[in-house]
Each structure stands twice: as C-alpha cells, then as structure tokens.
C-alpha cells in the first residue's frame, strides 16, 4: 500500500500580531490507524497545539469540516496570534495503541509574528 506522507507545504508563514495563521497539513494515506496532532517545537519541551481528544483549544479551529468522511486535510487555523506563538509547528501522525505512539512527522512550518500594523 502507499506509504504515508505528511505534507506541510509551507516552510514558513508570517502573520501580523492579532491576525489568524493557517497551518496547512495533508496526509496521503489513512494508515496507520491513529490520530493526527499538532505541536509547536520538537523534543520533550514541545507544546501540544491541537488534538481532538484533549482540549478545549479555544484559539484553534480545523480547516476541514469535522464531519468530512475519509478526511486527509488536517490544516488548522490559530486566531489572535501573539509573539508568543512564534515557532515551528509540526503535524504528526500517531499510531493507535496503549498509549498511541508517534509514527511520522511533517517537515514543520515556521511561524513568525510581525508587529501589529499601526
């Protein structure tokens, strides 16, 4: 079967403070079974930005409809961006298990925050 690829097409995104940032992520396979999660940063200090189990994540919305069947678009929008949001965001596929285990990561999208226009 087709090997899963996680495509984050934007290497970087620049957003003015107070605006919304869209972080794109698509996958090429429904396998392995398991969830997608978004993180800022890598390693043990990474911060969970979105998954569908925990939360709420009041500033994060999914771009695709939540009732879309066989969804392969896991892009998110983060509202009211502040300088604290700057960093590299990773879209990561987990393999279902007890607990779920990280399977593959996208290449990451670096979010930079511009000063709010006066």
């Amino acid at each position: 079967e087709e090997e899963l690829q996680i495509i984050q097409p934007d290497k970087s995104v620049s957003v003015a403070a107070g605006e919304s940032a869209i972080l794109h992520c698509t996958i090429t396979s429904l396998f392995p079974v398991g969830p997608i999660q978004w993180f800022r940063g890598a390693g043990p200090a990474r911060v969970l930005i979105y998954n569908q189990r925990q939360g709420p994540f009041p500033r994060v919305t999914t771009v695709s409809e939540t009732t879309k069947r066989e969804n392969m678009d896991f892009s998110i929008s983060i509202s009211n961006i502040t300088p604290a949001d700057a960093g590299t965001y990773y879209c990561i596929k987990f393999r279902k298990g007890s607990p779920d285990t990280e399977f593959k990561s996208g290449a990451g999208t670096e979010l930079s925050v511009r000063a709010k226009p006066s």
């Epitope: 079967e1 429904l30 396998f31 079974v33 398991g34 569908q52 009732t67 066989e70």
Partner: antibody, heavy 120, light 108 residues
Amino acid sequence: DVQLVESGGGVVRPGESLRLSCAASGFSFSIYAMSWVRQAPGEGLEWVSTIGADDTYYADSVKGRFTISRDNSKNTLYLQMNSLRAEDTAVYYCAKDSTVGWSGDFFDYWGLGTLVTVSS
Amino acid sequence: EIVLTQSPATLSVSPGERVTFSCRASQNVRSDIAWYQQKPGQAPRLLIYAASSRDTGIPDRFSGSGSGTDFTLTISSLQSEDFGVYYCQQYYDWPPFTFGGGTKVEIK
C-alpha cells in the same frame, strides 16, 4: 456498489479452529481499515477485531485466540479463529471502516454474515 | 471501556408516530456516535455518524442529536419499513469499539 461476502462459517467443537473469509468488491479495499463484528443468537453487536495496514486490534475476549489478516491482492479479509469456545457462537459480520473528521472509525458497509456454531 | 446504555429496550409504535431513542455513554464521547438499524435476518445498516450526520441515502425522517454523554435518534414519522432494532456505537475511545444493547421497535 460495495459488496462484502463472508464465508467459512460452520459447526465446530470446542477447542477447534475455523477460518473466516470476506471477499470485498466495489471500493479500493487496500486503503481502508476493515473489521469483524459478531452477534450471538438473539443478542446485540460485539466488536471483535480491526485491521489497518499491518496494525491489528482485538477485543479482550478473543485476544490470543483470533488473528485478523488481509490480502490486498485478493481484496479479502480473514479471521483465523483458534481454541474456539461455546461463547464464540455467533453470526460474524465483515465491515468496512470509515473515518470522519479527525476522529475514530465506524462501519459504513456490512456483509450479510456467516454463522459460527461451537458445540460439543 | 465505554459503556453505552440504550433506552427503552423495546418500543411499541404505530406507523406515522414520532419515535425517539436514547443512548447514554458512561463518559464523554464528544460527538463520536453512530447509529445503525438492523432488521430481522439482515446485517446492520449505518444511519447516522458523528452524532447527527445522515449517511448517504438515509431518508430525512431520521435525525440524530446530542454530544458528550447523551444522544438521541429520532424518526419523525415511523414507516412500516422502519421496524427493527436500533443500535448506537461509540468510536471516541477504542479499542474496544462498543455498542449499546439496542432498542427494538415493534408494531403496536
């Protein structure tokens, strides 16, 4: 049209083995997770097992005794059932999984089922 | 394991009546609930997924609602072909996928 056709059911004694098959057509079999769900006579539905690509999941009641597998070249799902018990007596349904949004799976197409009877 | 409790176990209804089925989860399952119809001697048929989305080809007299722990399936005007058993299923936390015990709809 999606079609799922189970076969391989029958009457066996406790401790014996049986292998169920499910022939799938009308969709791209290899890209979907597939499951087995059973229904004991006069009872409700009980999930048995699910397979993704090579990832497999089992109900506690069958773990270590049943093995789910698939042959994508033949569009066929299998359930190898060993050490069968009287409580495994049921109609076994093959079901195609569907995912929605960012969440888990439900079953959007079902076969007609095959009856497995375990009796001494 | 998430337990789904369906009530009532049996409903006696006349054609044309409005019918409501309840499914209660032992813990929060968000909107990750599907509903199935099973007629005697037949396989289950998907009616509703994501708590309220009708599957392709399902008549609009069927509707689902709820989130969290309490879910409802409603048939606005029962037709003769709607008799059978209705099951809810959660897919929020698995394995295992779990089903409710079912609600049987019979002719009054």
